[in-house]
């Protein structure tokens, strides 16, 4: 057995509509059938959960209806999208992967993706 490695991009720039997407890839040491993916935001020493989803291998991952995250899975790769971001949400977003079943449990934590969010300039009033 060996520890699980998780890879994610170092930097992502959110779109002008406040949407950021990145890939979280894990090197699975075992044959997991149930995987939990969590996105955590680290600001200073505080870590807060942004969203989490558990999925069965081969199935789609589904976040809660009120989640700001959506995602798709393909093998050992998860494509994550975070919506509704504003400039104040700029920060380090960490991908945490847990192989929940069958035992043994494995933990993998990425180094984090720095997401930069720039609020769009308000449109100037037109004189027409």
């Amino acid at each position: 057995c060996k520890a699980m490695h998780v890879a994610q991009p170092a930097v992502v720039l959110a779109s002008s509509r406040g949407i950021a997407s990145f890939v979280c890839e894990y090197a699975s040491p075992g044959k997991a059938t149930e995987v939990r993916v969590t996105v955590l935001r680290q600001a200073d020493s505080q870590v807060t959960e942004v969203c989490a989803a558990t999925y069965m291998m081969g199935n789609e991952l589904t976040f809660l209806d009120d989640s700001i995250c959506t995602g798709t899975s393909s093998g050992n790769q998860v494509n994550l999208t975070i919506q509704g971001l504003r400039a104040m949400d700029t920060g380090l977003y960490i991908c945490k992967v847990e192989l929940m079943y069958p035992p043994p449990y494995y933990l993998g934590i990425g180094n984090g993706t720095q997401i930069y969010v720039i609020d769009p300039e308000p449109c100037p009033d037109s004189d027409f």
Epitope: K2, A3, M4, T38, L40, V47, I94, Y105, I109
Partner: antibody, heavy 119, light 106 residues
Framework: QVQLVESGGGVVQPGRSLRLSCTAS????????MHWVRQAPGKGLEWVAV????????HYGDSVKGRFTISSDNSKNTLYLQMNSLRAEDTAVYYC????????????WGQGTLVTVSS | EIVLTQSPGTLSLSPGERATLSCRTS?????LAWYQQKPGQAPRLLIY???SRATGIPDRFSGSGSGTDFTLTISRLEPEDFAVYYC?????????FGGGTKVEIK
């Protein structure tokens, strides 16, 4: 603030059962993995079991597998450890502990409850 | 299961001295934590992720290492630092602890 309070320890005969409880406050119980860790008198720490998040997954240490059952009631913010077929070597202080968001290291611990298995 | 080996078993030092505690894991991992335990008390988290200090831990405590060899260093021992220290791996279940190192007053 986060608090964990264990109860249910005591003296029990070999082969008998006991149920430990751990009441949590100050955080959302279902967002964390919750663990039991024990320490035999004068010995080191031994991880016993974990229940994950919504309670659908549980993992156990080899020495208690098949005898101990971990469970939780999220509505009561309470963690349980049902201990069956107790042996003398199960004598220990049992701690409940919260696994942190970034992994199963334990940022908060209860004060512990002593279980003595003796005839 | 992953085996953690701590050394030395006991460290006899004087206040103000530097303490260096070792933890070796049987499998390479960065998911390593350190705890301090005093008699009659629950353990207290010091370090996680091999080198990150937990909230409220004085900066005289530092963790280092990677792969299979890890170190907890107490730069200048204070009277309240004399205790037993445990390392723990949390990357793969079952989560395991080292046997502990007792830091005692010389």
């Amino acid at each position: 603030q986060v608090q964990l309070v264990e109860s249910g320890g005591g003296v029990v005969q070999p082969g008998r059962s006991l149920r430990l409880s751990c009441t949590a406050s100050g955080f959302t119980f279902s967002n964390y993995g919750m663990h039991w860790v024990r320490q035999a008198p004068g010995k080191g720490l031994e991880w016993v079991a974990v229940i994950w998040y919504d309670g659908s997954n549980k993992h156990y240490g080899d020495s208690v597998k098949g005898r101990f059952t971990i469970s939780s009631d999220n509505s009561k913010n309470t963690l349980y450890l049902q201990m069956n077929s107790l042996r003398a070597e199960d004598t220990a202080v049992y701690y409940c502990a919260r696994g942190e968001r970034l992994g199963s290291y334990f940022d908060y611990w209860g004060q512990g409850t002593l279980v003595t298995v003796s005839s | 299961e992953i085996v953690l080996t701590q050394s030395p078993g006991t460290l006899s030092l004087s206040p103000g001295e530097r303490a260096t505690l070792s933890c070796r894991t049987s499998v390479s991992s960065s998911y390593l934590a350190w705890y301090q335990q005093k008699p009659g008390q629950a353990p207290r988290l010091l370090i996680y992720g091999a080198s990150s200090r937990a909230t409220g831990i004085p900066d005289r405590f530092s963790g280092s290492g990677s792969g299979t060899d890890f170190t907890l260093t107490i730069s200048r021992l204070e009277p309240e630092d004399f205790a037993v220290y445990y390392c723990q791996q949390y990357g793969i279940s079952p989560f395991t602890f080292g046997g502990g190192t007792k830091v005692e007053i010389k």
